[in-house]
């Protein structure tokens, strides 16, 4: 019997200061190039090493970005979202959704050698 995969969804406000080379991440998604089926949201596809996002440490690959400086990212074309980030200014506030995978084992199952059994 396989364990069930559940997801814990949390939201967080992340304030980034634009570094010398920018914010330091890549995105996918948008109404014209859905990354998740039936979801035109904007997702973080890559965090660049030593970039502003990586140095801050909170933004993760796979996070969904809900808004930038209070502006909703719903129903945006991909490049419109890119332009929004590029023009977001020096201090950038991101509302993000983290999706943490939680592995639930079958009820009553204990691993071999589990001392609590």
């Amino acid at each position: 019997m396989n364990g069930r995969v559940d997801y814990l969804v949390t939201e967080e406000e992340i304030n980034l200061t634009r570094g010398p080379s920018g914010l330091g991440f890549n995105i996918v998604g948008g109404t014209d190039q859905q990354y998740v089926s039936n979801d035109s949201g904007i997702y973080v596809s890559r965090i660049k090493e030593n970039g502003a996002a990586a140095l801050d440490g909170r933004l993760q690959e796979g996070d969904k970005i809900l808004s930038v400086n209070g502006q909703d990212l719903k129903n945006l074309l991909h490049q419109d979202a890119v332009d929004l980030f590029r023009n977001a200014g020096y201090a950038v506030s991101l509302r993000v959704q983290h999706r943490l995978q939680v592995q639930n084992g079958p009820i009553g199952h204990r691993g071999e050698g589990d001392p609590s059994g």
Epitope: F25, N26, R46, Q79, V82, R86
Partner: nanobody, 127 residues
Framework: HVQLVESGGGLVQAGASLRLSCAAS????????MAWFRQAPGKEREFVAE????????WYSDSVKGRFTISRDNAKNTVYLQMNNLKPEDTAVYYC?????????????????????WGQGTQVTVS
């Protein structure tokens, strides 16, 4: 292996126009983005213009906005830079670059570190 060859540079007077071409060979042309950068004597290489395939958007540096136009011809595997009303400060070696990172679009203004392939450059001198 992608090869980029620029042409069209030269010596012109202020106010004149030039059109640079960059021919790509050795790979598919529909990369994420093509761009032009330039390097003036004694200065860092700087971004000029980018043409992204996503919704065919273009992006220009403030110094060339309204004077330069980037375009591409996929059938000819070529990207162009039309430069009008040239100024002495436009004097530089102009480089064509190709960005092929498919892990999404960078949210940052075009930066030379993003680009994977570069041409040898073509000299533009404005007197």
């Amino acid at each position: 292996h992608v090869q980029l060859v620029e042409s069209g540079g030269g010596l012109v007077q202020a106010g004149a126009s030039l059109r640079l071409s960059c021919a790509a060979s050795g790979g598919t042309f529909s990369s994420y983005a093509m761009a032009w950068f330039r390097q003036a004597p004694g200065k860092e290489r700087e971004f000029v213009a980018e043409d992204s395939w996503s919704n065919h958007r273009v992006w220009y540096s403030d110094s060339v906005k309204g004077r330069f136009t980037i375009s591409r011809d996929n059938a000819k595997n070529t990207v162009y830079l039309q430069m009008n009303n040239l100024k002495p400060e436009d004097t530089a070696v102009y480089y064509c670059a190709d960005y092929r990172d498919y892990s999404g679009s960078t949210v940052d203004p075009p930066n030379q570190s993003e680009y994977d392939y570069w041409g040898q450059g073509t000299q533009v001198t404005v007197s």
